[in-house]
């Protein structure tokens, strides 16, 4: 807490300018009017204050706006945003995407801090849903943002926003998240033709059910092994050897290198060895000839 001291004669700040660099902390406290600071916040970032001086300026704003800063001040916080606590940010009502961008810019290049997470949460809740422009902005600054949301939060993403998603934005998503995103992507891209559709849907296929994979196998899509390895195991298991061959096209040869890894390993265990041999890849572990395969999952469902 800075002591209340009178401002020395002739030092009262008439505007926020670089002469304030030379003020001691107590002089800033005594000589800078909080209302003046609030109206000229855009100038603060152009002036190389010390972090200690910025603490004084924050204190002045806190006194002026105990219920939370107005958006006109928030948009120009700059370095001062780094001084804010999540508790400070929870008092804010941020509605402008420009304000959000300005503050994300301040944190650019850093991991998502608790302050930024709180800011985004406030912003998205204020908007009611994660619209395309917001998603565009957030994934530009934080490619992993989408995968940091819970499946429940992802359910509020409208299909139209899916157009803003880039493949790298989904790199860290787990199957539960892709289960929510895949149907939205399918809906968003439904009017595209075969090859264009596959390019767009490919990153989301970790949430695709068996029937959709079967349909894709009829479209000469040539899925690469990296995508195939990210598919849900339960969606891959029912696929026949012929369907996997069509789905992968020339990439089918890559199965040999992945035969010990899921989902390939589990899929091999479900195929007849005869059928696997038709691929000519030397895949081993299929069901020997003459064995009967019982689908116990159906029996369990009936009982």
């Amino acid at each position: 807490e800075v002591e209340k001291t009178a401002c020395p004669s002739g030092k009262k700040a008439r505007e926020i300018d670089e002469s304030l660099i030379f003020y001691k902390k107590w002089e800033l406290e005594a000589c800078v009017d909080a209302a003046l600071l609030a109206t000229q916040m855009d100038r603060v970032n152009a002036i190389p204050f010390t972090y200690e001086q910025l603490d004084v300026l924050k204190h002045k704003l806190d006194e002026l706006y105990p219920q939370g800063y107005p958006e006109s001040v928030i948009q120009h916080l700059g370095y001062l945003f780094l001084k804010m606590s999540p508790e400070d940010i929870r008092k804010w009502n941020v509605t402008s995407l420009e304000t959000l961008k300005a503050l994300l810019e301040v944190n650019k290049g850093h991991e998502m801090s608790p302050q930024v997470a709180t800011l985004i949460d406030r912003f998205v809740k204020g908007r009611g849903q994660l619209d395309k422009d917001t998603l565009d902005t957030l994934t530009a600054f934080y490619p992993g943002y989408l995968c940091s949301l819970s499946p429940e939060e992802l359910s509020s993403v409208p299909p139209s926003s899916i157009w803003a998603v880039r493949p790298q934005d989904l790199d860290t998503c787990d199957p539960r998240q892709l289960d929510v995103l895949y149907p939205k992507a399918r809906l968003a891209f439904q009017n595209m033709n075969g090859s264009e559709y596959f390019v767009k849907i490919q990153s989301f296929l970790g949430g695709a059910p068996t029937e959709d994979l079967k349909a894709l196998s009829q479209q000469n899509v040539s899925m690469d092994l990296a995508t195939f390895m990210k598919l849900r195991t339960d969606a891959v298991l029912p696929l026949t050897v012929a369907e996997v061959q069509k789905l992968l096209g020339p990439h089918v040869e890559g199965l040999k290198a992945e035969e010990r890894h899921r989902p390939v390993r589990d899929w091999i265990l479900r195929q007849r060895q005869d059928d696997l041999d038709t691929l000519g890849l030397g895949l081993q572990g299929g069901i020997p000839n003459g064995y009967l395969v019982l689908d116990l999952s159906m029996q369990e469902a009936l009982s």
Epitope: D17, P48, E105, V106, N107, G109
Partner: antibody, heavy 125, light 108 residues
């Protein structure tokens, strides 16, 4: 042309003080801040502080606070840097530099567009 | 204070080649308050770039700066013999101003 000319090399003993001068010419001396930067052997550049010649306001890096004093004499367009209680760690080349006037509206710039030639200071017993 | 890290420490290239020098800040630098200087032994440093991307007066257009936040780059599109030197970045957004340790560009 615009230039800053510094005083010559100095050899000092530990505990002594040092005062280097930096004379500006070819521009209005009081319109531009003067900064001081040093470079120890094999090290990077280290900012020491600013002075505004028109009113004598100073701003020092915390590392040098209390040990450095920046002054100017506007009648001779000269800036001075005094460093006290010298140790061998103060062996360095000291530069004065003019703050660039590359400002647009309230977007100030504090890069240094004209530099002195440097003054070599050796502190040794 | 804001700490600047430069990489690589040394860049060995031939005249005519492209040089890409990196400067990373420990805290974001608001309003791109970052400058680049060229420094040759026995000479005064020379300002190349200010505001992260604006060339200083008289600086050839083979020098360009880019970046924002914490990551900044100086690019020399085609190295001339006189470009072999040490390059420093400097932030002037927060006091105290700080410099990076420098990148030495030498002839391969």
């Amino acid at each position: 042309q615009v230039q800053l000319v510094q005083s010559g090399a100095e050899v000092k003993k530990p505990g002594e003080s040092l005062k280097i001068s930096c004379q500006g010419s070819g521009y209005s001396f009081t319109d531009y801040w003067i900064g001081w930067v040093r470079q120890a052997p094999g090290q990077g550049l280290e900012w020491m502080g600013w002075i505004t010649p028109n009113n004598g306001n100073t701003n020092y890096a915390p590392k040098f606070q209390g040990r450095v004093t920046l002054t100017t004499d506007t009648s001779t367009s000269t800036a001075y840097m005094e460093l006290r209680s010298l140790t061998s760690d103060d062996t360095a080349v000291y530069f004065c530099a003019r703050r660039g006037r590359n400002s647009s509206g309230y977007l100030y710039y504090y890069s240094m567009d004209v530099w002195g030639q440097g003054t070599t200071v050796t502190v040794s017993s | 204070e804001i700490v600047l890290t430069q990489s690589p420490g040394t860049l060995s290239l031939s005249p005519g080649e492209r040089a890409t020098l990196s400067c990373r800040a420990s805290q974001p630098i608001v309003a791109s308050h970052l400058a680049w200087y060229q420094h040759k032994p026995g000479q005064a440093p020379r300002l190349l770039i200010y505001g992260a991307s604006t060339r200083a007066a008289g600086i050839p257009d083979r020098f360009s700066g880019s970046g924002s936040g914490t990551d900044f780059t100086l690019t020399i599109s085609r190295l001339e013999p006189e470009d072999f030197a040490v390059y420093f970045c400097q932030q002037y957004g927060i006091s105290p101003f700080t410099f990076g340790p420098g990148t030495k560009v030498d002839i391969k």
